[in-house]
Amino acid sequence: LVVTPPGPELVLNVSSTFVLTCSGSAPVVWERMSQEPPQEMAKAQDGTFSSVLTLTNLTGLDTGEYFCTHNDSRGLETDERKRLYIFVPDPTVGFLPNDAEELFIFLTEITEITIPCRVTDPQLVVTLHEKKGDVALPVPYDHQRGFSGIFEDRSYICKTTIGDREVDSDAYYVYRLQVSSINVSVNAVQTVVRQGENITLMCIVIGNEVVNFEWTYPRKESGRLVEPVTDFLLDMPYHIRSILHIPSAELEDSGTYTCNVTESVNDHQDEKAINITVVESGYVRLLGEVGTLQFAELHRSRTLQVVFEAYPPPTVLWFKDNRTLGDSSAGEIALSTRNVSETRYVSELTLVRVKVAEAGHYTMRAFHEDAEVQLSFQLQINVPVRVLELSESHPDSGEQTVRCRGRGMPQPNIIWSACRDLKRCPRELPPTLLGNSSEEESQLETNVTYWEEEQEFEVVSTLRLQHVDRPLSVRCTLRNAVGQDTQEVIVVPHSLPFK
C-alpha cells in the first residue's frame, strides 16, 4: 500500500480542502471511524488499484485517524493497513467528542488505560486533573490518543487553553472492580446451642467487591428458607460478610452449614462448611481419667488439672474436706478455669510450696442449670526420707546392736549394708547387704509407725550383730518414692580398747 502524502501525521488548515490517495495491488479503501467515507476508487491500466479521499471545508472535527486498507481485508498483514493521523487546529473545537463508552472505563485488574481526551491542535498543552481537584497529574500525554497510565478509581477531566480561554473536557469515570481469588472463612457465634437458642453464622470474603453468597443448611433441605443479610465491614476494605441467623433453633437444625461464594467476573468460587449441634439441654462431661489418689511433694508446687466439656459455660468450685476453696491472698492456692475451645474447659488447682496440712480430700464441681459433674480424689503429700538417728550400742549379752530411725512419706524401705574391708570398700568392693538371712551372723527387727498429725511414717530398725571380730562400717539407707538418705557408723570388736 502506498499513501500520499505519506504522513504518518499531518497538520491541515481549517476550511481548506485536502486530497488523500492510497494505491495498491488489490482494491483499496479509506476508512474513518470504522466507516467508509465517500471516495473515488479506480483501477489503472497497469493493474494498480487506487482510492482518492477528498476532504473539503475541513473543521476540527475532521481531526483523527484515517486508515487505508485492502478492500478484501481477510487475514490482514501489517503492510495491508496504513494509518494516517490528521490534525485540523480549530479554535472553535475544544476537545474532540467521545462516544459514551469512552467516558466510562471499567477495570478488573491493575493495568494501563488511556483517558482519550484529544484536541485538534498538536501544539496545545493539555493537562489531566481529578474532577474535584486543580492539581495537574504527572501522566504522559499523546496528542493522538490521550493520557495513558495506571489510574485510581476516580473521575478525571482534561484541561487546555485555546487563546485566552480555558477549556474542560467531559468527565471520564474510571471504575476498578476489586477481584481476586476467593478465600472464604466461616464461623459461628456458637457451634453448640440448646434448642430454643439462636444460631448465627458469618461467612466472610476478603479482596472482592462483587460476590454472590449461597448458604446450604439443614432447614433449607426441608424447604424452610432463611434470608441471609449481607454487609460490608467498614474498617476493612473489600471485606464482605453474609450473616445467616436462625432464631429459636430446633434439634433438626443440627448438621452442616455451608457457605458457597462465587465471583462472576473471573469465575472464581470457594466454599467452607461448619458443623452446628443443637442439644436438647445443656451438659457437663468429664474428659479423661483422674486417679482417686494424687500425690504432691512437700515444699514443691503442684498443679492438679481436670479437663471437661460443657455447654452452656458452667460454674466451677473446688472443695477440700468439704470446705470451699478460693484463691488465697498469701498466694498458697491458685484456682483457674480456662476455656480452651468453645465447649472444652481446663480447671486447675495449684498448690504453691505444698505443706503437709494440704493433704486431704479434694473435690471439683462443675455445674449449670441443666447438669453437673463432680470429681474427687485424695491428695497425699510425699515427704522425702530423712535418717534421723543411727546409733551403735553394746548390750551385756555380748552382741552389738545398731539402731536406725527415719521418717518419710510414702513409707520408707530400709536397707542395711556393711563394709568389712575398710580400705577397699565401698570404692572397690560393694558393701555386703545385711538382713535376716540364716547364714549371716546378724538379725534385723523393724517397726513402722504412722504419725497422723505429721502425715508421715516413722521407721525404726535394729540390727543385731552376733560377733564382730574386726572394725566394720555399717550403713543404714532409707528409700521412698521421692528420695533416699544414708548414714553410716563404724562398729569395732569388743576386744579392741577403743570404740
Epitope: F106, E152, R154, S155, R176, L177, E209, P237
Partner: nanobody, 116 residues
C-alpha cells in the same frame, strides 16, 4: 458506609421489559455519577449506561440506545434502569457502580435472563 443494593432481576421473554433498581446509602446521589455495567456469561464487563449526579445528562452504549432508559430519584437516592425490547444477548449479571471518596463502589449484581 457506602452501600449499593440492587433489585429487579428476573427471567423475562424476548421483547419483554424489566426495571432494575439500585438504592444507595452512605452518600448522596446528586454528587456522583452512577453507571450500570453488565457481564454476560463468559464475556468481559460491558458498560451499559450512566447518569450524572444531577440527573440531567444520560449516557448509553450503542448496543442499548433506544431500548434502555436510565433515570434517578434523588429523594429516594435510587437509580433505575428501564429495559425494554429485551433480547437474548441482554442476558447478563447487571451491576450498578459509583464513585465515593477515593474508590468505586459496586452493587451486589442482579441476574437478568432473557429466554423464551
Amino acid at each position: 458506609q457506602v452501600q449499593l443494593v440492587q433489585s429487579g432481576g428476573a427471567l423475562v421473554q424476548p421483547g419483554g421489559s424489566l426495571r432494575l433498581s439500585c438504592a444507595a446509602s452512605g452518600f448522596t446521589l446528586s454528587n456522583n455519577a452512577m453507571s450500570w455495567v453488565r457481564q454476560a456469561p463468559g464475556k468481559r464487563l460491558e458498560w451499559v449506561s450512566a447518569i450524572d449526579g444531577s440527573g440531567g445528562t444520560t449516557y448509553y452504549a450503542g448496543s442499548v440506545k433506544g431500548r434502555f432508559t436510565i433515570s434517578s430519584d434523588n429523594s429516594k437516592n435510587t437509580v433505575f434502569l428501564q429495559m425494554n425490547s429485551l433480547r437474548a444477548e441482554d442476558t447478563a449479571v447487571y451491576y450498578c457502580a459509583t464513585h465515593g471518596g477515593d474508590r468505586s463502589y459496586w452493587g451486589q449484581g442482579t441476574l437478568v435472563t432473557v429466554s423464551s
